[in-house]
């Protein structure tokens, strides 16, 4: 309805100024031009427009740039970034790290995690690098956002960022993400030795292959049961009882409390009961003695 009204004579603004705060909403709709707003974003931020008025301005900009805002405008957004949705941001093309850092500052403490993550993802998609400065600019946002990036975006995250990742950050990661992050972590921690290496890499072990876990079992790491439970089932079931015993060390006793839960249960199902009995923990669920295991998981040659 407001769209239908014409701009009253003499009300057409040639610049963004304080007079606009006294315009009725329908007048803003009828009179204000999106390209003028884009050119004078600094003034839009400076003048005390109401949220309602800024929403009208946003609607104007969205109509002017239906394919997403140009980078020249994104660089000038300032506080106006707070009115932009993650969906809007996904349409953008951002190549300047300074633009990203500036907007991350604006979003800090504003319950804008989704926008901040979308902005960084968009920057990575354009070939940008997520450096440690940027991770610091993301501030208190848990690094679980790494799991929101596409696998392609993850490739451009430098290995050094892995030093900042905590155990809870990867809880919602897909198996594919975990695999990629594990590779990055291996490269980040390659110069760390012994137990310190294990302490760093254990956060990422959900992405480790059976081969990696076998290698780890040779190093007396005494993995705790919480880390063991985070290992991917496909890797775990390939380990023998002896290898798991080496991997867990004295923590092997904790398998008993987890024997009816995945992934421990899945691993037990693939072990011979006689091997489990040798542990002396009373673990049940293994392959009964004298049974032959046939693997029907043979891939067909033609599909």
């Amino acid at each position: 309805d407001a769209e239908q009204k014409a701009c009253p004579p003499g009300k057409e603004p040639y610049k963004v100024d304080e007079d606009l705060i006294f315009y009725q909403n329908w007048e803003l709709e009828a009179c204000v031009d999106g390209t003028m707003l884009a050119r004078q974003m600094d003034l839009v931020n400076e003048i005390p427009f109401t949220y309602e008025q800024l929403s009208i301005f946003k609607h104007k900009l969205d109509k002017t740039y239906p394919q997403g805002y140009p980078e020249s405008l994104i660089q000038q957004l300032g506080h106006f970034f707070r009115y932009v949705s993650p969906e809007d941001i996904h349409q953008w093309n951002v190549t300047s790290p300074d633009t990203v850092k500036t907007l991350l500052k604006v979003s800090k403490g504003q319950k804008m995690n989704a926008q901040a993550i979308a902005l960084v993802a968009c920057y990575l998609r354009g070939g940008g690098q997520l450096d440690e400065d940027m991770v610091k600019a993301l501030g208190d946002i848990p690094l679980s956002y790494l799991c929101d990036f596409s696998p392609q975006d993850l490739h451009s995250v430098p290995s050094s960022v892995m030093w900042l990742v905590g155990p809870q950050d990867l809880d919602k990661c897909s198996q594919r993400h975990l695999g990629l992050l594990y590779q990055k972590a291996c490269s980040a921690f390659q110069n760390v030795s012994g137990l310190e290496y294990f302490e760093k890499i254990k956060t990422f072990l959900g992405g480790a292959s059976v081969k990696d876990l076998r290698a780890l079992s040779q190093h007396n790491v005494s993995m705790d049961i919480a880390t063991f439970k985070r290992l991917q089932v496909d890797s775990l079931v390939g380990l023998s009882v002896a290898e798991v015993q080496k991997l867990l060390g004295p923590n092997i006793v904790d398998l008993k409390t987890e024997e009816d839960k995945s992934p421990v249960r899945d691993w037990l199902f693939r072990q011979h009961q006689k091997d489990l009995d040798r542990l002396g923990l009373g673990l049940q669920g293994g392959i009964p003695n004298g049974y032959l295991v046939l693997d029907f998981n043979v891939r067909e040659a033609f599909s």
Epitope: P48, F49, R82, Q110
Partner: nanobody, 115 residues
Framework: EVQLVESGGGLVQAGESLRLSCAVS????????MGWHRQDPGKERELVAT???????YYANFVKGRFTISRDNAKNTVYLQMNSLKPEDTGVYYC?????????WGQGTQVTVSS
């Protein structure tokens, strides 16, 4: 969340004065600026005056020189001092706080100026 409660409205003669108060509570730190708006029956709400966090003030042409907006940070209150009132100043006056990501409004206080 920000809560706003207006007071000070009433019935006065043309030429007299009134002072409206707006008591602010809640997440005050999130407020960017505040304003007084008025609404006549059947009309769109219009801005009368605005004050920013640093104290810069803005006035609509129809109240310039007669109305003054001010704030008392210690009391978390914004005022609108209205002098030389005219019958056309009659309406419901609303206090508004702009924060991220919304505008918060009070319930309004009626001002009636009789000739």
């Amino acid at each position: 969340e920000v809560q706003l409660v207006e007071s000070g409205g009433g019935l006065v003669q043309a030429g007299e004065s009134l002072r409206l108060s707006c008591a602010v509570s809640g997440n005050i730190g999130s407020i960017r600026h505040m304003g007084w708006h008025r609404q006549d029956p059947g009309k769109e709400r219009e801005l009368v005056a605005t004050i920013t966090t640093v104290g810069t003030t803005y006035y609509a042409n129809f109240v310039k020189g007669r109305f003054t907006i001010s704030r008392d940070n210690a009391k978390n209150t914004v005022y609108l001092q209205m002098n030389s009132l005219k019958p056309e100043d009659t309406g419901v006056y609303y206090c508004r706080a702009t924060a991220h990501p919304t505008d918060y409004w009070g319930q309004g206080t009626q001002v009636t100026v009789s000739s």
